[in-house]
Interface confidence: medium
Amino acid sequence: EPHSLRYNLTVLSWDGSVQSGFLAEVHLDGQPFLRYDRQKCRAKPQGQWAEDVLGNKTWDRETRDLTGNGKDLRMTLAHIKDQKEGLHSLQEIRVCEIHEDNSTRSSQHFYYDGELFLSQNLETEEWTVPQSSRAQTLAMNVRNFLKEDAMKTKTHYHAMHADCLQELRRYLESGVVLRRTVPPMVNVTRSEASEGNITVTCRASSFYPRNIILTWRQDGVSLSHDTQQWGDVLPDGNGTYQTWVATRICRGEEQRFTCYMEHSGNHSTHPVPS
């Protein structure tokens, strides 16, 4: 998977009036990495691993960047026409990626009240608008505002692309993201199901990177996909991931079943507790 940096900013308006403040989260390689603390007006690392990425450096640069982005997004929301009474949101998601072959991708997406209405490839500066007519109108609003000063806009988007990649490379240089492999902790539990059956659940937690194989086996053979239930692979807030797989088996057959886990070239099997 490519290395990625993802900015997620949201600003709000009430009865057409843009509210002060903004919400911001930054994800590094899919993990919660930074959050803007509105009480302290500071960018704050999300967990120990995020602090380790920058070591003892301050987060002034991140605070300045997020504050600037929040201000820009508030200005954009202020230029959206025909805002209904009540509460409305404008969300911007910006992503940059560095792939294994060193190629890069950058994109930006705008959502109004949760509906995607405008995307831009920051490298080619190509805009994409969904087919819905509301999206077309919103996109026209925002693009009209953003292109008022064409040269400034061109510079702005080039800078967005370059800045995002520069930050991503800076974080990767710490080595914390690039080198680390954290093996999963695997835990198998059982619970009563219908009469004569039990549900066995295999949980893998605190692993990195996110790619993992977790499956139930009977007599050493993997069960079919439709006899198992899988949970999503989700961040656990500590820079690592968690997931689970469950299946239903007959009571008394427990010794025939094992949970198989494969992660970063290592694998292990885990029996059902008696």
Epitope: G16, D82, K84, E85, M140
Partner: antibody
Framework: QITLKESGPGILKPSQTLSLTCSFS??????????VGWIRQPSGKGLEWLAH???????YYNPSLKSQLTISKDTSRNQVFLRITSVDTADTATYYC??????????WGQGTTLTVSS | DIVMTQSPATLSVTPGDRVSLSCRAS??????LHWYQQKSHESPRLLIK???QSISGIPSRFSGSGSGSDFTLSINSVEPEDVGVYYC?????????FGGGTKLEIK
């Protein structure tokens, strides 16, 4: 009290340029979210939206007439203007200006009538 | 462009009747639908905003309903001063378009 009032030439010949003025009071076009638009209505027919200008000078035009239309404003004098080039008999109508905020036209002028005749 | 279709074109009613005027959009416009009343030799005035929201100063006998592409303006007890033409308007997306109108007459 919010009022809008349209003024125009009354009669034009085909191919001439129509210049309309909307003078308003009770609100300001420097207020965020505020806009003023033009709508016309041929006698005995329905309403057709023509153009719109916003507080930030963003302009919208009806695509079917865009090449003929120019909307502008003088914020300090509380006026909005509409120019329609190369008028034809089909442009004979009553022209209204209306305030638009939060998505709808909430105040309308009394209208000004244009007759295009050779 | 979103096409707004109103029906019926003309409606003849007796004072006190409850009437319903229909407006249909050619595609979904959520609740971005506004109703206007235009009396003879007057400019239009806003009756209902966002499909069902009332407007200050408009009599409570006027109400609106609907969402998506089908909308209704109801007058629950028609009075003689309600005669005129009623227009619906797409406020959802550019260009803003009006229906052809429904003319309300008193028998």
């Amino acid at each position: 009290q919010i009022t809008l009032k349209e003024s125009g030439p009354g009669i034009l010949k085909p191919s001439q340029t129509l210049s309309l003025t909307c003078s308003f009071s009770g609100f300001s076009l420097s207020t965020s979210g505020m806009g003023v638009g033009w709508i016309r209505q041929p006698s005995g027919k329905g309403l057709e939206w023509l153009a719109h200008i916003w507080w930030d000078d963003d302009k919208y035009y009806n695509p079917s007439l865009k090449s003929q239309l120019t909307i502008s404003k003088d914020t300090s004098r509380n006026q909005v203007f509409l120019r329609i080039t190369s008028v034809d008999t089909a442009d004979t109508a009553t022209y209204y200006c209306a305030r638009r905020t939060q998505g709808y036209f909430d105040y309308w002028g009394q209208g000004t009538t244009l007759t295009v005749s050779s | 462009d979103i096409v707004m279709t109103q029906s019926p074109a003309t409606l003849s009613v007796t004072p006190g009747d409850r009437v319903s005027l229909s407006c249909r959009a050619s595609q979904s416009i959520s609740d971005y639908l506004h109703w206007y009343q235009q009396k003879s030799h007057e400019s239009p005035r806003l009756l209902i905003k966002y499909a069902s929201q009332s407007i200050s100063g408009i009599p409570s006998r006027f109400s609106g309903s609907g969402s998506g592409s089908d909308f209704t303006l109801s007058i629950n007890s028609v009075e003689p001063e309600d005669v005129g033409v009623y227009y619906c308007q797409n406020g959802h997306s550019f260009p803003w378009t009006f229906g052809g109108g429904t003319k309300l007459e008193i028998k």
